[in-house]
């Protein structure tokens, strides 16, 4: 299963920094409970 990334990790909304939880690098387990890679 592939994981995808937002195209920017942080965006300013009304002067508030919002973290896009998925833009954190490929295949690092950003999606809760999604099996990524193999057993390591």
């Amino acid at each position: 299963d592939a994981e995808f990334r937002h195209d920017s990790g942080y965006e300013v909304h009304h002067q508030k920094l919002v973290f896009f939880a998925e833009d954190v690098g490929s295949n690092k387990g950003a999606i809760i409970g999604l099996m990524v890679g193999g057993v390591v």
Partner: antibody, heavy 112, light 111 residues
């Protein structure tokens, strides 16, 4: 068998702190993020935050920002979640999740 | 915070019959990259939750294809084409466009 094994149930007084552990068994915990969630009795799921064990980077939900600390010990494949200034509303089952694996949950009861 | 609202909160089902759960988000979960950041989880009785669907329509590994999900930016539906006894539990929708928030859950039980 690959699994995440959490520490046992805890009973704490209001104002105290609790530290829950999550150990990877047959699983290298430093490769993937470790998420922490909780579920109060009869309630839904609530995300607390996550840690990248590779570099210690954390992201916390603003609600918990001032009270939670997530750490890891890669030498023992164990992640930790410490919650301070406990109140009765923190009574819940706390879960760790990494990749497709979920811990069995740790019941934390806050009661005077 | 993005608020996720599910309906119904309780759903009695008949094995072999279809079932559907609705979820609405307070903000569009469709990002400009084309991905919709909507997820479905199932918590079976006495178990930890499990991921069913990720990014609105992708089936997680090992999830039977009787489960499917569709929707727009704010309105989503999880469908079970033919309910089986093992499908009982509490279903949660969730988003991670901005951190993670979950719906209040829909309890599915056999009639």
């Amino acid at each position: 068998q690959v699994q995440l094994v959490q520490s046992g149930a805890e009973v704490k007084k209001p104002g105290a702190s609790v530290k829950v552990s999550c150990k990877g068994s047959g699983f290298n915990i430093k490769v993937y993020y470790v998420h922490w969630l909780r579920q109060a009795p009869g309630k839904g799921l609530e995300w607390i935050g996550r840690i990248d064990p590779e570099n210690g980077e954390t992201i916390y939900t603003p609600k918990f920002q001032d009270r939670v600390t997530m750490t890891e010990d890669t030498s023992t494949d164990t992640a930790y979640m410490e919650l301070s200034s406990l109140r009765s509303e923190d009574t819940a089952v706390y879960y760790c999740v990494s990749s497709g694996y979920w811990g069995q949950g740790t019941l934390v009861t806050v009661s005077s | 915070d993005i608020v996720m609202t599910q309906s119904p909160l309780s759903l009695p089902v008949t094995p072999g019959e279809p079932a559907s759960i609705s979820c609405r988000s307070s903000k569009s979960l469709l990002h400009r990259n084309g991905i919709t950041y909507l997820y479905w989880y199932l918590q079976k009785p006495g178990q930890s939750p499990q991921l069913l669907i990720y990014q609105m329509s992708n089936l997680a590994s090992g999830v039977p294809d009787r489960f499917s999900s569709s929707g727009s930016g704010t309105d989503f539906t999880l469908k079970i084409s033919r309910v089986e006894a093992e499908d009982v539990g509490v279903y949660y929708c969730a988003q991670n466009l901005e951190l993670w928030t979950f719906g209040q859950g829909t309890k599915v039980e056999i009639k």
